[in-house]
Interface confidence: low
C-alpha cells in the first residue's frame, strides 16, 4: 500500500487491476437508444466528475517527484465512481442482466482504491451529486453517461500505472 511521505504503491498490482478495470468498463458500456451524440465535446464533461488534469502530477515528471498528488486524484475518482455504481442509478430498475460486468467493475474499483489508500491516513473523497432519477429511462441514460466518463478516467489511470510499473517500481 501507499503510505504518506512518498513511498510507492504496488505499481505492478495497480497496473494489472487498472487494466482489468479498462476491460470491464468497456464491456459494461450499455447500448442506449435515446441519445443523439453527434459529437460529444468537452463541454459535456461534468465539473463534478473527477478528472485527471495537467496540474495533478500524473505526468512522468510529476510521478517521479511525488506520486502522491496523482495517486490521491486517482483515488478520489475511484471512490466517486464506486459510489455511483453502488447507487440507485445502477441498482434500480431496469435491472442489470445477471451476467452484467457492472458488479465486477464495482468490486474492482473498490479493490484498486484500497491499494491506493494510505494506511492510517484519510484522503478526502469527492462528494457525489445527489442523483435520484425517478424513471427507468433516466437511469439508463445516466448509466450510459457514467460509464462513458468512467472509461475515460480508467484509461488515464491505467496509463499512469503502466508508467509507474515500468519506471518507478523498486
Amino acid at each position: 500500500r501507499a503510505v504518506p511521505g512518498g513511498s510507492s504503491p504496488a505499481w505492478t498490482q495497480c497496473q494489472q487491476l487498472s487494466q482489468k478495470l479498462c476491460t470491464l468498463a468497456w464491456s459494461a458500456h450499455p447500448l442506449v437508444g435515446h441519445m443523439d451524440l453527434r459529437e460529444e465535446g468537452d463541454e459535456e464533461t461534468t465539473n463534478d466528475v473527477p478528472h485527471i488534469q495537467c496540474g495533478d502530477g500524473c505526468d512522468p515528471q510529476g510521478l517521479r517527484d511525488n506520486s502522491q498528488f496523482c495517486l490521491q486524484r486517482i483515488h478520489q475518482g475511484l471512490i466517486f465512481y464506486e459510489k455511483l455504481l453502488g447507487s440507485d442509478i445502477f441498482t434500480g430498475e431496469p435491472s442489470l442482466l445477471p451476467d452484467s460486468p457492472v458488479g465486477q467493475l464495482h468490486a474492482s474499483l473498490l479493490g484498486l482504491s484500497q491499494l491506493l489508500q494510505p494506511e492510517g491516513h484519510h484522503w478526502e473523497t469527492q462528494q457525489i451529486p445527489s442523483l435520484s432519477p425517478s424513471q427507468p429511462w433516466q437511469r439508463l441514460l445516466l448509466r450510459f453517461k457514467i460509464l462513458r466518463s468512467l472509461q475515460a478516467f480508467v484509461a488515464v489511470a491505467a496509463r499512469v500505472f503502466a508508467h509507474g510499473a515500468a519506471t518507478l517500481s523498486p
Epitope: 453527434r38 459529437e39 463534478d48 451529486p129 453517461k145
Partner: nanobody
Framework: EVQLVESGGGLVQAGGSLRLSCAAS????????MGWFRQAPGKEREFVAR????????YYADSVKGRFTISRDNAKNTVYLQMNSLKPEDTAVYYC?????????????????????WGQGTQVTVSS
C-alpha cells in the same frame, strides 16, 4: 437575469408539425446548455430535450426521439424545438429552460429543479 420567452405553440392535428422558439433577453445563451420540458394537465413536468452550448451534444426523451429536433442559433440567442409527427399525448405546455452550468453534471439536465431560468410556457394541443 435572463428572460426566456417561448412561442410557436398552437392547435395542430395528429401527424402535424410545430416549431417552438425560445428567445432570450438579458444575457447571451451561448455559454449555457438549454432544455425543453413539458407539462401535461395533472402530470409532472418532464424532460423533452437538451442541447449543449455549441450544439455538439443533444439528448432526447425516449418518447420524442426521432420526431423532435432541438437546435439553437447562438447569434439570434434563440433555441428551437421542431416537433414532427405530433401525437395527442404530446399535448402539454412546453417550457424552455436554461441550465446554469455549461457542463454536463450527473443527472442534472434531466431534472427540472436543476434549471435556473424558465419561460412562461407555450401551449401545444394535438387533436386526433
Amino acid at each position: 437575469e435572463v428572460q426566456l420567452v417561448e412561442s410557436g405553440g398552437g392547435l395542430v392535428q395528429a401527424g402535424g408539425s410545430l416549431r417552438l422558439s425560445c428567445a432570450a433577453s438579458g444575457r447571451t445563451l451561448s455559454s449555457y446548455s438549454m432544455g425543453w420540458f413539458r407539462q401535461a394537465p395533472g402530470k409532472e413536468r418532464e424532460f423533452v430535450a437538451r442541447i449543449s452550448p455549441s450544439g455538439s451534444a443533444i439528448y432526447y426523451a425516449d418518447s420524442v426521439k426521432g420526431r423532435f429536433t432541438i437546435s439553437r442559433d447562438n447569434a439570434k440567442n434563440t433555441v428551437y424545438l421542431q416537433m414532427n409527427s405530433l401525437k395527442p399525448e404530446d399535448t402539454a405546455v412546453y417550457y424552455c429552460a436554461k441550465d446554469p452550468s455549461p457542463y454536463y453534471r450527473g443527472s442534472a439536465y434531466l431534472l427540472s429543479g436543476s434549471y435556473d431560468s424558465w419561460g412562461q410556457g407555450t401551449q401545444v394541443t394535438v387533436s386526433s
